[in-house]
């Protein structure tokens, strides 16, 4: 069975693979494969080191830790929902049937849809209702919120009072919209 | 959720003999390389033997070479340590623990630890 | 044999940063892990591979490592963190311990 790991569409994934090597800088082959290892190899290949080095890799596909210490774990850049399934690390241990198999398998969600508001400080003071904060981990995401006891006639009056207004650019700067009615 | 029990854990007289299990769930025993882990009472820990993911290597501390063994079992999910020629010296809590790789050179980093057999040899 | 080296025991404040450090020779070449042991508990990962966090383990804790020493770093330390530190080394035929630091939250 699988390690499963997840990921949000945006971001980028990343699929843990360590090996010791037998001594500093004495490095193993490795190779990442799209699909469960099979007998021999790897499937799909998208990426390989070698003795020395990381020696064939496509687009979005690295290495971020110290492979030389046997850190080979793979990071996915910018993961779109196809890059979901299972991936295959492999140590290519000298010597027969001595491969390290890993069996990785990535679950991408999709990404939670919130506006990037610009100016937050102007935002927040004009409409002080308008925006709550919702923890995500580590970074925090600004969506707008709902109107709890204001009325759509004070709604079109602060409307129309910022309509000339700087925070009026911003709001259409940042893509976000207000409707009336 | 990985979980890792030890047993086999007594009281011993010197030159006796020991033979301790661990029984792994919640992950794939035999791609991970497995350790023995000692610990005596108020002193850190210290490791005593490693073994590859397939059972093929093994490696073991100075201070127990050619008296302890290490051995797993991939079909049963279960890491051994068979204990020979004990000696006060090897009192101590044995933790198993699970490595973090396939551990064919070494251990690498210990992800998961049991809570550990404690073992006493006395006379 | 290889040996790691710490200081017995390190005090920080609360909500301060502490360091706590695993000296070594040409450590840096190696890959460092640090575990964090609680009176009467098995010891848990908190570092691996360097500077790599496992999952569950808060942020607030960090790592590097280069030259000959090796650093585990607790931004914003909290009551909890109070334990006995590891770090942990292969070297060549065994994997090999520091005998440990003390972190004292006042």
């Known amino acids: 069975s699988e390690v499963e790991y997840r990921a949000e569409v945006g971001q980028n994934a990343y699929l843990p693979c360590f090996y010791t090597p037998a001594a500093p800088g004495n490095l193993v082959p490795v190779c990442w494969g799209k699909g469960a290892c099979p007998v021999f190899e790897c499937g799909n290949v998208v990426l390989r080191t070698d003795e020395r080095d990381v020696n064939y890799w496509t687009s979005r596909y690295w290495l971020n830790g110290d492979f030389r210490k046997g850190d080979v774990s793979l990071t996915i850049e910018n993961v779109t929902l196809a890059d979901s399934g299972i991936y295959c690390c492999r140590i290519q241990i000298p010597g027969i049937m001595n491969d390290e198999k890993f069996n990785l398998k990535l679950v991408i969600k999709p990404a939670k849809v919130t506006p990037a508001p610009t100016r937050q400080r102007d935002f927040t003071a004009a409409f002080p209702r308008m925006l709550t904060t919702r923890g995500h981990g580590p970074a925090e995401t600004q969506t707008l919120g709902s109107l709890p006891d204001i009325n759509l006639t004070q709604i079109s009056t602060l409307a129309n009072e910022l309509r000339d207004s700087r925070l009026a650019n911003d709001l259409r700067d940042s893509g976000a919209t207000i409707r009336i009615g | 959720e990985v979980q890792l029990v030890e047993s086999g854990g007594g009281l011993v007289q010197p030159g006796g003999s020991l033979r301790l299990s661990c029984a792994a769930s919640g992950f794939t025993f035999s791609s991970y390389a497995m350790s023995w882990v000692r610990q005596a009472p108020g002193k850190g820990p210290e490791w005593v033997s490693h073994?590859?993911?397939?059972?093929?290597?093994?490696k073991y501390a100075d201070s127990v070479k050619g008296r302890f063994t290490i051995s797993r079992d991939n079909a049963k999910n279960t890491l051994y340590l068979q204990m020979n020629t004990l000696k006060p010296e090897d009192t101590a809590v044995y933790y198993c623990?699970?490595?973090?790789?396939?551990?064919?050179?070494?251990?690498?980093?210990?992800?998961?630890w049991g809570q550990g057999t404690q073992v006493v040899v006395s006379s | 044999s290889y040996e790691l080296t710490q200081s017995p025991s390190v005090s920080v404040a609360l909500k301060q940063t502490a360091k706590i450090t695993c000296g070594g020779d040409?450590?840096?070449?190696?890959?460092a892990q640090w575990y964090q042991q609680k009176p009467g508990q098995a010891p848990v990962l908190v570092i691996y591979?360097?500077?790599r966090r496992p999952s569950g383990i808060p942020e607030r804790f960090s790592g590097s490592n280069s030259g000959n020493t090796a650093t585990l770093t607790i931004s914003g330390a909290q009551a909890e963190d109070e334990a006995d530190y590891y770090c942990q080394v292969w070297d060549s035929s065994a994997a090999v311990f520091g005998g440990g630091t003390h972190l004292t939250v006042l």
């Open positions: 040409n450590i840096g070449s190696k890959s």
């Open positions: 623990a699970k490595d973090v790789s396939g551990g064919y050179y070494g251990t690498y980093a210990l992800d998961a």
């Open positions: 073994i590859n993911s397939g059972g093929g290597n093994t």
């Open positions: 591979a360097d500077s």
